[in-house]
């Protein structure tokens, strides 16, 4: 099983609360950085990545970045906190349960990102929006 | 205001049948994983189980003493989580306490007898 | 499953005593390591995480240390209300294993 890797330090002395005034507390996410992938043409992928770790702030949210270039195809996996943009962007879907990939413009690439609000979110990321999690051809995607 | 609520904890003879309700408010339920951890009279703390999100698929794992005689499960519309516990033992006798995994938030506990 | 041993099982100690509690893993859990406190009749309560860090509204007198498979709680003045049972927990894989307690007790 996982481990849980916790961040270095936790500040817990606010509350944190989402727009419904709900409490937040820090989230699990897949947190792997980035790493070579194989998720290509695909409805949706499992990150694969073997790291869950507690996020350091509650507000920070599980992100997921795909990139393809001529060279390769990476997957990064992290916490972060949608106040602030993350590779220039801001995470405009950070409140949704479900890691739906949304296509930014970058030169040279194709760039998608997502960020979602549930534990372990970013473990599976959608490229389609139609797609329904219960899918049992789910594709796996392995890391090189 | 955060809180867990455990239920449904009493007597129950050997080989026997209990369901736990834990009913969380104050944060978006769906969005967490949660588990249950136990102690019985006198004793130490006891890992029992923990549910992921249903939208990851609701997977579940167990501590081997109760693999296969208790199941775990959630309801996010009600945001209640359920400790359902069957062929109960005389050494499932506990307190269950119903946590948020991995984070620092448990509920008061509710007391399991299981006694002839 | 990964055997967590906490040394001692009891311990006698008057208010201002420094206290240390250790913690052993059978295996390596790098630093996955948490820390509760519990009073008879209360849910524990969460004091360290990752081995060394503090939750937040614990007082500065607990503190935690150690990495791989020995760990230490140490309580620099011991103060009336930390009289309770202490706990050692792994969270490095499933299931999370508790050390069977230390309880402190006053001289």
């Known amino acids: 099983t996982i481990p849980p890797h916790v961040q270095k330090s936790v500040n817990n002395d606010m509350i944190v609360t989402d727009n419904n005034g709900a409490v937040k507390f820090p989230q699990l996410c897949k947190f792997c950085d980035v790493r070579f992938s194989t998720c290509d043409n695909q409805k949706s992928c499992m990150s694969n990545c073997s790291i869950t770790s507690i996020c350091e702030k509650p507000q920070e949210v599980c992100v997921a970045v795909w990139r393809k270039n001529d060279e390769n195809i990476t997957l990064e996996t992290v916490c972060h906190d949608p106040k602030l943009p993350y590779h220039d962007f801001i995470l405009e879907d950070a409140a949704s349960p479900k890691c739906i990939m949304k296509e930014k413009k970058k030169p040279g690439e194709t760039f998608f990102m997502c960020s979602c609000s549930s534990d372990e979110c970013n473990d599976n990321i959608i490229f389609s929006e139609e797609y329904n999690t219960s899918n049992p051809d789910l594709l796996l995607v392995i890391f090189q | 205001q955060v809180q867990l609520v455990e239920s449904g904890g009493g007597l129950v003879e050997p080989g026997g049948s209990l369901r736990l309700s834990c009913a969380a408010s104050g944060f978006t339920f769906s969005n967490y994983w949660m588990s249950w951890v136990r102690q019985a009279p006198g004793k130490g703390l006891e890992w029992v189980g923990r549910i992921k999100t249903t939208i990851s698929g609701g997977a579940t794992d167990f501590a081997a003493p109760v693999k296969g005689r208790f199941t775990i499960s959630r309801d996010d519309s009600k945001n209640t989580l359920y400790l359902q516990m069957n062929s109960l033992k005389t050494e499932d006798t506990a307190v269950y306490y119903c946590t948020l995994d991995l984070r620092a938030y448990w509920g008061q506990g509710t007391l399991v007898t299981v006694s002839s | 499953d990964i055997q967590m041993t906490q040394s001692p099982s009891s311990l006698s100690a008057s208010v201002g005593d420094r206290v240390t509690i250790t913690c052993r893993a059978s295996?390596?859990?790098?630093?996955?390591l948490n820390w509760y406190q519990q009073k008879p009749g209360k849910a524990p309560k969460l004091l360290i995480y990752?081995?060394?860090s503090l939750q937040s509204g614990v007082p500065s007198r607990f503190s935690g240390s150690g990495s791989g498979t020995d760990f230490t709680l140490t309580i620099s003045s011991l103060q009336p209300e930390d009289f309770a049972t202490y706990y050692c927990q792994q969270s490095y894989s499933t299931p999370p294993t508790f050390g069977q307690g230390t309880k402190v007790e006053i001289k």
């Open positions: 990752a081995a060394s």
């Open positions: 295996q390596s859990i790098s630093s996955y």
